[in-house]
Interface confidence: low
């Protein structure tokens, strides 16, 4: 029952002698598993026996009998789905029909597959796109209706026998739908590939040649052109004739139109392969090419540079750069249209020829003010000498020159004077626009370049000015030489180095920081009394009476300056001690008597000691000795001693008389 057997496999398989054939195959037997399989070669149905006759290439039966062909022919299928076969190697006489005789428990089926085995490896087939254009990527396909697991092959692409550099992608198909090997090559053909032979070569696994297919490339491209010119160097003089010829070296398809271009612009009414230029002018110099078009597009030849030669035109001068800064470098360029280029130049400065300058450029490495002026040139080539053009002006700029600071006042200048200075210069380009002064001060500038210093200071030593245009030029500083009275006068003790004690030798110095003029006189004074006219005041043996307030004065021709008062202090031991008594040296008993120890001392007495008429020290140490109530027994002579850091002094005896009171006398 045919409806129960469904087969899928390629209709025809292709191979060659010695290769192999792999037959992908699937089937479906709906009534159960396969029980018997026989592979026939060219089976014929025998009506008498109701069986198929033919060569049995493979047999699989219940009893397991297998012919010797089994080694070459393999059934790789199973009992219900797969009916794949392999013949390895395959022979020429295997061509024809293969019959797959399938039997299940209740059903039988004969499936036929065509096998085409050639004597030699058959060639692959190259497939090209319908149109190939230069520089457009195309895919070349090489297809071979063969693939077999037991017989590896490779497809190689060659261009004129040279392996193509581009990487090819090879794919194989061994399916029930198709069996093939395919190589695809992506390739961007150039116009020069037109007409070239591309080969797809079939090789075995070792790279041995088996067969090939070749095609000739038909690459559509714009016309490829050659331009020829007479004269061949394309160099002519005004009035000469020029002929240009355009040759098409390749065009696919054939060209349709021709045109000529000069400097990229189409020339009207020039539509032949020859361009004739008669009596050329210099304006016809330029780049010429021919353009030929076909259906792909326009193709252009290389450019021919036509040079029409003529004598130099009136020249102009270009200055790099004007205005120029003194000391910088300047380049002059003589510009003159000429063909050929000028070979000799003559240069002029303010109308006078510049000796030794024959180049297109004049380079002055260090510009000076005298270089300013008009520069012009004349160019010369083999066809003649040009005319001198209008020239160009060089402006040389420089800072103000010979700047000086001038004092306008009569000399000498005294502290407190008003001083006027002016800033002068010799020349400047551009003009001076401002002035600067050093050092800076809150000074007046009544007019440009004039400085007025009111109440000039003693320490205004030097002033410098700068005259400025784009740059500032500074003058050398000018000394004001301001005269002033001596400054910072002060008294300084030279000796002794420590405090002054009575009897010491003492020297005082009159110091000052500065004086202009330098010649000075000194004066020493104490309480308005002149003491000396030297810079030093000396005491051989100082006494306490010399203590006091001292000043020194220093004079010059401008004025006199006094020091601050300086206090001279003399240290001495207590002296001129005496004991004074209060209310007197005669006191009535019972009253109070106060004895005071008076002295002269520097520093003041720090410690007192009291003694009686027996030279016995009393237990009292203050300046005052208070007796209260006073007794008759207190009568007697007393003296005191004073002590300071310098020494001690004692008083003479003083007598206290204590007399009886009337009450005491009354009781007696």
């Amino acid at each position: 029952d045919s409806s129960k057997w469904v087969f899928e496999h390629p209709e025809t398989l292709y191979a060659w002698e010695g290769a192999c054939v792999w037959i992908p195959c699937t089937y479906r037997a709906l009534d159960g598993d396969l029980e018997s399989f026989i592979l026939f070669h060219n089976p014929e149905y025998n009506k008498n026996t109701s069986k198929f006759d033919g060569t049995r290439l493979y047999e699989s039966t219940k009893d397991g009998k297998v012919p010797s062909e089994q080694k070459r022919v393999q059934f790789l299928g199973d009992k219900n789905k797969n009916c794949t076969l392999s013949i390895h190697p395959v022979h020429l006489n295997d061509s024809g029909q293969l019959g797959l005789r399938m039997e299940s428990k209740t059903e039988k089926w004969m499936e036929r597959i065509h096998l085409n085995v050639s004597e030699r490896p058959f060639p692959p087939h190259i497939q090209l796109p319908p149109e190939i254009q230069e520089s457009q990527e195309v895919t070349l396909t090489c297809l071979l209706n063969f693939s077999c697991y037991g017989y590896p092959i490779q497809l190689q692409w060659l261009l004129e026998g040279v392996p193509m550099r581009q990487a090819a992608v090879t794919s194989t198909s061994l399916t029930i739908k198709s069996v093939f090997t395919r190589s695809e090559l992506k390739f961007s053909p150039q116009w020069s590939h037109h007409g070239k032979i591309v080969t797809c070569q079939l090789q075995d696994a070792d790279g041995k040649f088996l067969s090939n297919d070749t095609v000739q490339l038909n690459v559509k491209h714009t016309p490829k052109l050659e331009i020829k010119v007479t004269p061949s160097d394309a160099i002519v003089r005004e009035g000469d004739s020029v002929t240009m010829t355009c040759e098409v070296s390749s065009s696919n398809p054939e060209y349709t139109t021709v045109s000529w271009l000069k400097d990229g612009t189409s020339l009207k009414k020039q539509n032949t392969f020859t361009l004739n230029l008669r009596e050329v002018t210099k304006d016809q110099s330029g780049k010429y090419c021919c353009q030929v078009s076909n259906d792909v597009g326009p193709g252009r030849s290389e450019e021919v540079f036509l040079q029409v030669q003529y004598a130099p035109e009136p020249s102009t001068v270009q200055i790099l750069h004007s205005p120029a800064v003194e000391g910088s470098q300047v380049e002059f360029l003589c510009m003159s249209l000429a063909n050929p280029l000028p070979t000799n130049y003559t240069w002029y400065h303010n109308g006078k020829e510049m000796q030794g300058r024959t180049e297109e450029k004049v380079h002055i490495p260090k510009i000076l003010p005298w270089h300013a002026g008009t520069y012009s040139c004349v160019a010369e080539n083999i066809l003649g000498t040009g005319q001198r053009g209008p020239g160009a002006e060089l402006d040389v700029q420089y800072p103000p020159k010979k700047v000086t600071t001038v004092i306008q006042n009569p000399m000498p200048i005294r502290e407190g004077d008003t001083v006027t200075l002016s800033c002068n210069y010799n020349s400047s380009n551009p003009s001076v626009t401002r002035y600067e002064w050093k050092p800076h001060g809150a000074w007046e500038e009544p007019s440009l370049g004039v400085l007025k210093i009111q109440n000039v200071g003693w320490d205004n030593t030097t002033i410098a000015c700068a005259a400025c245009n784009s740059w500032c030029s500074w003058a050398s500083p000018v000394a004001l030489n301001v005269q002033y009275a001596p400054r910072d006068v002060r008294v300084r003790k030279i000796k002794p180095l420590s405090e002054i004690h009575s009897g010491n030798s003492v020297s005082l110095q009159c110091d000052f920081s500065s004086s202009h003029p330098k010649e000075v006189q000194f004066f020493w004074e104490k309480n308005g009394r002149l003491l000396g006219k030297e810079s030093q005041l000396n005491f051989d043996s100082i006494s306490p009476e010399d203590a006091g307030s001292y000043s020194c004065w220093v004079n010059n021709s401008i004025g006199q300056t006094a020091s601050k008062a300086w206090t001279l202090e003399v240290l001495y031991a207590p002296r001129r001690l005496r004991v004074s008594m209060s209310p007197g040296d005669q006191v009535m008993e019972g009253k109070s008597a106060t004895l005071t120890c008076e002295s002269d001392a520097n520093p003041p007495v720090s410690h007192y000691t009291w003694f009686d008429w027996n030279n016995q020290s009393l237990p009292y140490h203050s300046q005052k000795l208070r007796l209260e109530p006073v007794k008759v027994q207190h009568s007697g002579a007393y003296w005191c001693q004073g002590t300071n850091s310098v020494g001690k002094g004692r008083s003479p005896l003083s007598t206290l008389t204590v007399y009886y009171s009337p009450e005491t006398i009354g009781r007696r």
Epitope: E160, V162, S192, G195, E226, S250
Partner: nanobody
């Protein structure tokens, strides 16, 4: 247009040698791959060998391998075919041309007698 002029053919005995020359006009000669072809009476024109534009690569048909050598001189716009160990089956009119072909020249007759 470009012109191709072949020369150097003649009658030679089997085993002998000949050197064919092909002069090409046109400034693009040095850009072109050049090929030598031959056509025997009653047969299709077959390609004998190819040389690329700078002369660095050549390929020959299986029938002439090891016997024929192609070379070129771009300064002279000329391509050469050195033929050694000639056989009677090499008898043909020999042509040179570019790839792709320019208009064909007249060719030069080579006859190899046994």
């Amino acid at each position: 247009q470009v012109q191709l002029v072949e020369s150097g053919g003649g009658l030679v005995q089997a085993g002998g040698s000949l050197r064919l020359s092909c002069a090409a006009s046109g400034s693009t000669f040095s850009l072109k791959a050049m090929a030598w072809y031959r056509q025997a009476p009653g047969k299709q024109r077959e390609r004998v060998g190819v040389i690329n534009s700078d002369g660095s690569y050549t390929t020959d048909a299986a029938s002439v391998q090891g016997r024929f050598t192609i070379s070129r001189d771009n300064a002279k716009n000329t391509v050469y075919l050195q033929m050694n160990s000639l056989k009677p089956e090499d008898t043909a009119v020999y042509y040179c041309n570019t790839m792709p072909p320019w208009p064909w020249g007249q060719g030069t007759q080579v006859t190899v007698s046994s």
